[in-house]
């Protein structure tokens, strides 16, 4: 029954990182003319028959993985890519520092370190303007984020979050921003 219908897109506006009590809208977008959508929250057995889910105030219980599909005739589309909706501000903010310092020469190395007083085992580093976290292959969840051979593209404002692998969609508040300055470019 699941045929060649292309998968829809699912996005969170303004962002999939949502501070507690702040609004967010999940929007499922399929081809023109489609009006039968199903938006599911995974690992909760629940779904709604609308393309748009407006959350006026983010709650912990709404954090998690979402997916959507649409129906055309009797055929279901392929499912959208999963969207991970994260509630932030659940825990106190970590601190973010740069070693050896926030000013680094082009071509040099710098390590951004995220530290927290709590026993969290997961950390995510975001650069302002980038939608996805800064990931080191297989190791993005570590507290240290080494940046090797810095270029001008690495300059900007960074923030980090801490969370637990037991509750991967409940994150801390963001750290205070750290401005990374690349000199000699």
């Amino acid at each position: 029954q699941s045929g060649p219908l292309p998968k829809p897109s699912l996005q969170a506006l303004p962002s999939s990182l949502v501070p507690l009590e702040k609004p967010v809208t999940l929007r499922c977008q399929g081809p023109p003319g489609v009006d039968l959508y199903r938006l599911e929250k995974l690992s909760s057995s629940r779904y709604q028959d609308q393309a748009v889910l407006f959350i006026p105030a983010m709650k912990r219980s709404l954090a998690g993985r979402y997916r959507c599909s649409y129906q055309n005739g009797s055929l279901w589309s392929l499912p959208s890519d999963q969207l991970e909706l994260v509630a932030t501000g659940v825990f106190a903010k970590p601190s973010l520092s740069a070693q050896p310092g926030p000013a680094v020469s082009s071509g040099g190395d710098v390590t951004l370190q995220c530290q927290t007083r709590y026993g969290f085992d997961q950390f995510a580093l975001y650069k302002e303007g980038d939608p996805a976290p800064y990931k080191n292959p297989e190791r993005w969840y570590r507290a240290s984020f080494p940046i090797i051979t810095v270029t001008a593209a690495h300059s900007g404002t960074y923030r980090c979050y801490s969370f637990s692998s037991r509750d991967p969609y409940l994150w801390s508040a963001p750290s205070d921003p750290l401005e990374l300055v690349v000199t000699g470019t």
Partner: antibody, heavy 123, light 112 residues
């Protein structure tokens, strides 16, 4: 309290037709997805078809697609299953079941079932 | 053949603990869908026993518990009683065509 009462079962010849009804009471029928689930004698449960709360989303098991038609009348608090081109393997007790709902969310499980109506397809 | 696989039968003496397994695939249980369990006493309609992998509706004794891991789930019954003798079915949802799927059912016999 929630009540689901099926009717319309009986003996029918292969190739024949039958229309099952499910009368719902004790809850806001138009808010809930509804399904038909069947159980052949001595066998397990088999989901047959479901319909969305507004009658828009409709799904069928592959075994009945093209032969059975699910519908609902929210004004009458009733669910229906029109069964055409019946086969011996359609012989079963047919249950009407309600899907759980909470606030804006529907759920993928059945919280209330009727007592069932027996459909026998035999020459 | 059922989409979800259950053992046809299990048995135990009164007071014992029994478990019933339910194995699915990456398109149903493994796709993020929960598992639900129903109890069908002889001659009656099925009744919801466990929803959302491990939650009990009001009125269901805490002797019944459920869990899920990966592409499978299990139902545990402790302190087995004669009135637990029934058929038990697991149920989930399948992403392929958005259909509801059941296990083949497990007949629980209370010995003695």
């Amino acid at each position: 309290q929630v009540q689901l009462v099926e009717s319309g079962g009986g003996l029918v010849k292969p190739g024949g037709s039958l229309r099952l009804s499910c009368a719902a009471s004790g809850f806001s029928f138009s808010d809930h997805y509804m399904s038909w689930i069947r159980q052949a004698p001595g066998k397990g449960l088999e989901w047959v078809s479901s319909v969305g709360s507004e009658g828009k989303f409709i799904d069928y098991a592959a075994s009945v697609k093209g032969r059975f038609t699910i519908s609902r009348d929210n004004a009458k608090n009733s669910l229906y299953l029109q069964m055409n081109s019946l086969r011996a393997e359609d012989t079963a007790v047919y249950y009407c079941a309600r899907h759980y709902r909470e606030f804006r969310w529907h759920y993928y499980y059945f919280d209330y079932w009727g007592q069932g109506t027996l459909v026998t397809v035999s020459s | 053949q059922s989409v979800l696989t259950q053992p046809p039968s299990v048995s135990g003496a009164p007071g014992q603990r029994v478990t019933i397994s339910c194995t699915g695939s990456s398109s149903n249980i493994g796709a993020g869908y929960d598992v639900h369990w129903y109890q069908q006493l002889p001659g009656t309609a099925p009744k919801l026993l466990i929803y959302g992998n491990s939650n009990r509706p009001s009125g269901v004794p805490d002797r019944f518990s459920g869990s899920k891991s990966g592409t499978s789930a299990s139902l545990a019954i402790t302190g087995l009683q004669a009135e637990d003798e029934a058929d038990y079915y697991c149920q989930s949802h399948d992403l392929g065509a958005h259909v509801w799927v059941f296990g083949g059912g497990t007949k629980l016999t209370v010995l003695g």
